[in-house]
Amino acid sequence: MAVTACQGLGFVVSLIGIAGIIAATCMDQWSTQDLYNNPVTAVFNYQGLWRSCVRESSGFTECRGYFTLLGLPAMLQAVRALMIVGIVLGAIGLLVSIFALKCIRIGSMEDSAKANMTLTSGIMFIVSGLCAIAGVSVFANMLVTNFWMSTANMYTGMGGMVQTVQTRYTFGAALFVGWVAGGLTLIGGVMMCIACRGLAPEETNYKAVSYHASGHSVAYKPGGFKASTGFGSNTKNKKIYDGGARTEDEVQSYPSKHDYV
């Protein structure tokens, strides 16, 4: 009963985690304009992995996709890759774990097979969670570096006469969503791995056979054979996120002339 609960809970926690990783990956607010100690501007800038947006005081929001691959920073590409790998692994893990659930009966599937599948999905969730945490952390590190670099030369001007305000960016909501989601997926994966141990069949109870050797009496019990952990999945890694960039040059948030809430 405890094993089933652990497995079920691990599945649910991982499911929430992966949903969070997908949400974080799609969110536009990975970095948001730093408003602290900054001149008060009537526009608010924020950026995601796939596009950057500007919200005006009027409420008009304009988002532009990053239509170049080669022109993007390598770190951003790496973060994208980590998040997508995390989503793909998580999605496969979810698929595997559905069949591994003790409460679901599929034909005459052995407990050993379910144990293998549970362990496999658990490992996938752990790696998925780590990918998400790594992706978000790399992006956060990039932000911190850029923040202090732009603080060093916050105002750049010609002879101090004309000043240009440098927009500084700080942590956006997506980073926190990503960290929490990655953590949940990781915890879910650990729970699945723990559940796997309970799912594995106990030692096979054979009758002890006595072999009489000269001068000694030796009893030999064949030990219970644990199932192999090599669960083979030939599910192909499909890219399940297409980049999220719109094909339009500008995306307006509403059809009317003005709109703010």
């Epitope: 304009q33 001149p39 008060v40 501007t41 009537a42 526009v43 800038n45 924020y46 950026q47 950057s52 947006c53 500007v54 005006e56 005081s57 009027s58 409420g59 008009f60 304009e62 532009r64 004309v162 000043q163 240009t164 305000v165 927009t167 009317s256 002339k257 003005h258 709109d259 703010y260 809430v261």
Partner: antibody, heavy 118, light 113 residues
Framework: QIQLVQSGSELKKPGESVKVSCKAS????????MNWVRQAPGQGLEWMGW????????TYADGFTGRFVFSSDTSARTAYLQISSLKAEDTAVYFC???????????WGQGTLVTVSS | DIVMTQSPDSLAVSLGERATINCKSS????????????LTWYQQKPGQPPKLLIY???TRESGVPDRFSGSGSGTDFTLTISSLQAEDVAVYYC?????????FGQGTKLEIK
């Protein structure tokens, strides 16, 4: 079409208060921020500030804090500018205007002349 | 506060001729996020409220004749009337719409020579 209709001219004595209204029609009132602009006789335009008609939050320009208060009544689809402790230098035409693309002032009221004289 | 300086203060141009009004801001009005300049141009005729002509420094408001055009970036902006018409006689204002407060230029009075 979008229209902003302001209240009529006011003649006030120094120290009195005045409340200028700006009634909006032709759009969802809370979708537009309402700006207030002052124009003294023969002078240029002076941006006083604006009110977010959805949240009720106001932003005031430096010279317009204290005696000047922006408010709005969503049900009446009306924005208000109240000026207390009137001074002679408050004599001006007061315009209301909505925020548009690029934070521009897209639609304007016809203006309300407030005259402060003893 | 951002200081908006228009030049000239007044301008007399013959009908059909080109009129150019300049506006300079004390800080850049270019937003790096969308590469747009938050500068607006208005036209005010005597006894009337101002009328929006151009926003984002160069985007013409719908219904505004195409003889009106805006250009410039950062701190230096220009309003050009390619062929002056009698109805264009007015005072023209530029406005900063990037930093609070949204300061106006002092205005440029356009007359017919």
């Amino acid at each position: 079409q979008i229209q902003l209709v302001q209240s009529g001219s006011e003649l006030k004595k120094p120290g009195e208060s005045v409340k200028v209204s700006c009634k909006a029609s032709g759009y969802t009132f809370t979708n537009y921020g309402m700006n207030w602009v002052r124009q003294a006789p023969g002078q240029g335009l002076e941006w006083m500030g604006w009110i977010n008609t959805y949240t009720g939050e106001s932003t005031y320009a430096d010279g317009f804090t204290g005696r000047f208060v922006f408010s709005s009544d969503t049900s009446a689809r009306t924005a208000y500018l109240q000026i207390s402790s009137l001074k002679a230098e408050d004599t001006a035409v007061y315009f209301c205007a909505t925020l548009g693309y690029g934070n521009s002032l897209a639609y304007w009221g016809q203006g309300t002349l407030v005259t402060v004289s003893s | 506060d951002i200081v908006m300086t228009q030049s000239p203060d007044s301008l007399a141009v013959s009908l059909g001729e080109r009129a150019t009004i300049n506006c300079k801001s004390s800080q850049s009005l270019l937003n790096s996020g969308n590469q747009r300049n938050y500068l607006t141009w208005y036209q005010q005729k005597p006894g009337q409220p101002p009328k929006l002509l151009i926003y984002w420094a160069s985007t013409r408001e719908s219904g505004v004749p195409d003889r009106f055009s805006g250009s410039g970036s950062g701190t230096d902006f220009t309003l050009t009337i390619s062929s002056l018409q009698a109805e264009d006689v007015a005072v023209y204002y530029c406005q900063n719409n990037y930093f609070y407060p949204f300061t106006f230029g002092q205005g440029t009075k356009l007359e017919i020579k």
